[in-house]
């Protein structure tokens, strides 16, 4: 089976690497524009230069291309706690990240929110906080893990998953209650 190619890929595959087919004349291969530039005019003929212009401020192209417009620079999302790691240049998009002691949680492929790394109070750090993953905590005896925080077993309701982890404490509480009812 031959993989389906889009029109642009079909057109590009006829020309050697770094060139593309002239949209009006498929016997001409034009040189692609360098990163940081965009296509202003196709080359007039074989062996003649493509007219490429530099991207304007606030836009970029990160690879060789024959785009009619540069791409708009991304903005870091303040409401998601993002900070700018590096500014947009003509050949590279803005790089956004999180502050120190924070990690990225991806809600979707291209949307992340910054959250504080868990400190593992009433527990120990099992795995340190990473760029894209929160600290993994192990809780001390008498505590159970809920939403990556160590919570006292006194907050464990019998119906919750914590009952297995807090079983000795729950039994003790039950035993104390029983002894008081004789």
């Amino acid at each position: 089976l031959v993989p389906h190619l889009g029109d642009r890929e079909k057109r590009d595959s006829v020309c050697p690497q770094g060139k593309y087919i002239h949209p009006q004349n498929n016997s001409i291969c034009c040189t692609k524009c360098h990163k940081g530039t965009y296509l202003y005019n196709d080359c007039p003929g074989p062996g003649q230069d493509t007219d490429c212009r530099e991207c304007e401020s606030g836009s970029f192209t990160a690879s060789e291309n024959h785009l009619r417009h540069c791409l708009s620079c991304s903005k870091c999302r303040k409401e998601m706690g993002q900070v700018e790691i590096s500014s947009c240049t003509v050949d590279r998009d803005t790089v956004c990240g999180c502050r120190k002691n924070q990690y990225r949680h991806y809600w979707s492929e291209n949307l992340f929110q910054c959250f504080n790394c868990s400190l593992c109070l009433n527990g120990t750090v099992h795995l340190s906080c990473q760029e894209k993953q929160n600290t993994v905590c192990t809780c001390h005896a008498g505590f159970f893990l809920r939403e990556n925080e160590c919570v006292s077993c006194s907050n464990c309701k019998k119906s919750l998953e914590c009952t297995k982890l807090c079983l000795p404490q729950i039994e003790n509480v039950k035993g104390t209650e029983d002894s008081g009812t004789t």
Epitope: E79, W107, F115
Partner: nanobody, 119 residues
Framework: EVQLLESGGGLVQPGGSLRLSCAAS????????MVWVRQAPGKGLEWVSH????????YYADSVKGRFTISRDNSKNTLYLQMNSLRAEDTAVYYC????????????WGQGTLVTVSS
């Protein structure tokens, strides 16, 4: 007590429009960025759109970009989602929520409103 009440869902034909509303109470609405998420039958939660406190910065998932518009009226404590050019794949229960702060979970959200796109 935080309450979020979605409305405006219903049955609509492909290409049609709907406007969802979310009435908020029990917190200072104007201080909170707000989110629309949806859950299609048998699928997980999908982030649809969010809006900052003042309604200036917005975000849209690629699947709805150019078709949906999020807005808010802080004087009415209400969040909106204008949905145009609806497609069958937009069929889902739509929920509004406060943007999470402490961790990646929704502490408060409504009961949802069902949007069905079908001919």
């Amino acid at each position: 007590e935080v309450q979020l009440l979605e409305s405006g869902g219903g049955l609509v034909q492909p290409g049609g429009s709907l406007r969802l509303s979310c009435a908020a109470s029990g917190f200072t609405f104007a201080h909170e960025p707000m989110v629309w998420v949806r859950q299609a039958p048998g699928k997980g939660l999908e982030w649809v759109s969010h809006i900052d406190r003042v309604g200036q910065d917005t975000y849209y998932a690629d699947s709805v970009k150019g078709r949906f518009t999020i807005s808010r009226d802080n004087s009415k404590n209400t969040l909106y989602l204008q949905m145009n050019s609806l497609r069958a794949e937009d069929t889902a229960v739509y929920y509004c929520a406060k943007l999470p702060k402490r961790g990646p979970r929704f502490d408060y959200w409504g009961q949802g409103t069902l949007v069905t796109v079908s001919s």
